[in-house]
Amino acid sequence: NFMYSKTVKRLSKLQEYQQYYPSLTCVMEGKDMEDWSCCPTPWTSFQSSCYFISTVMQSWTKSQNNCSVMGADLVVINTKEEQDFITQNLKINSAYFLGLSDPKGWRHWQWVDQTPYNKNVTFWHSGEPNSPDERCAIINFRSEEWGWNDVHCHVPQKSICKMKKIYI
């Protein structure tokens, strides 16, 4: 009876999410494997988040709006492990917007989700950021490694969206 009611709850939750995400990919987790964590298909998952790589070339503001429509934000990178996971799926000759910007050009960088900007957990390429006119951050492959660079916000780039996993 308990299992039945849990399944009914799950199905109703799935139906609720289906209006936003036509397809979800879910895995069982938790100590009793009773919880399902889901990401929209074809998003990838890492820890408690889902990631989507957009190959559409758009400005930073349009890229953030695009993520927002999908219930996400441009990616906020919190650890080196997270960055290493993300970069596995990126093309080395491309650049991708991050959810990091400096709208006033005062070198006050801010994450889109209001996560405090911690200088100790940043992965700027050597010599970056280097221009107060370049107020948005990308991740790209340079000098044999992935890192961040400041660029003009209005220049179209690919982008990465991130959202919390859906638990049902």
């Epitope: 503001t61 349009k62 709208p103």
Partner: antibody, heavy 121, light 111 residues
Framework: EVQLVESGGGLVKPGGSLRLSCAAS????????MSWVRQAPGKGLEWVAT????????YYPDSVKGRFTISRDNAKNSLYLQMNSLRAEDTAVYYC??????????????WGQGTTVTVSS | DIVLTQSPASLAVSPGQRATITCRAS??????????MHWYQQKPGQPPKLLIY???NLESGVPARFSGSGSETDFTLTINPVEANDAANYYC?????????FGGGTKVEIK
Amino acid sequence: EVQLVESGGGLVKPGGSLRLSCAASGFTFSSYGMSWVRQAPGKGLEWVATISSGDSYTYYPDSVKGRFTISRDNAKNSLYLQMNSLRAEDTAVYYCARQLYYSYGYYFDYWGQGTTVTVSS
Amino acid sequence: DIVLTQSPASLAVSPGQRATITCRASESVSFHGTHLMHWYQQKPGQPPKLLIYAASNLESGVPARFSGSGSETDFTLTINPVEANDAANYYCQQSIEDPPTFGGGTKVEIK
């Protein structure tokens, strides 16, 4: 006082080339992105090319891509526009304009007086 | 590309009256309260001159008779009261995304 002075315009035959120059003074040229904007006779404004302050980024509309090249020499406080394979529709007054960044975009806060390019056989 | 449509194409205004020019963008040029729409004045034989930046900010040295408003896709330049030397073409321009684009212009004539 900020000054932008264009030169190099003139009459050229279709298929020909011209190099426009813009001499900047009164500000730290190397700190600003710069653009060329043109205006055909009796028409509106059309952006033609942009170059970032550090020369790392150039951008063109499809109408001139592959034919026009924007460049700068920060040591000489000068902006250039090399125009090749010129067409009749490139006939216009060409303005050099300084970009001032604001939030996620920019605007053109100073403009030169313009130089006239006429493409005709 | 973002298309900017200005209206009217021309208008004639008497000195002391109000002139209103609108600029409609094919998509939003706003982001979190910042509106990346700018206005320029161009008199015959002269280069454009910046009047208003970011929808409503008056450029230094521009008379307070000029004002701008709007957000997202709809923006307005107002001249009130109009003076004789305001006869010119007026252009809007967006910069939220490359390529930067201009409106087709509005010619203001003084009656």
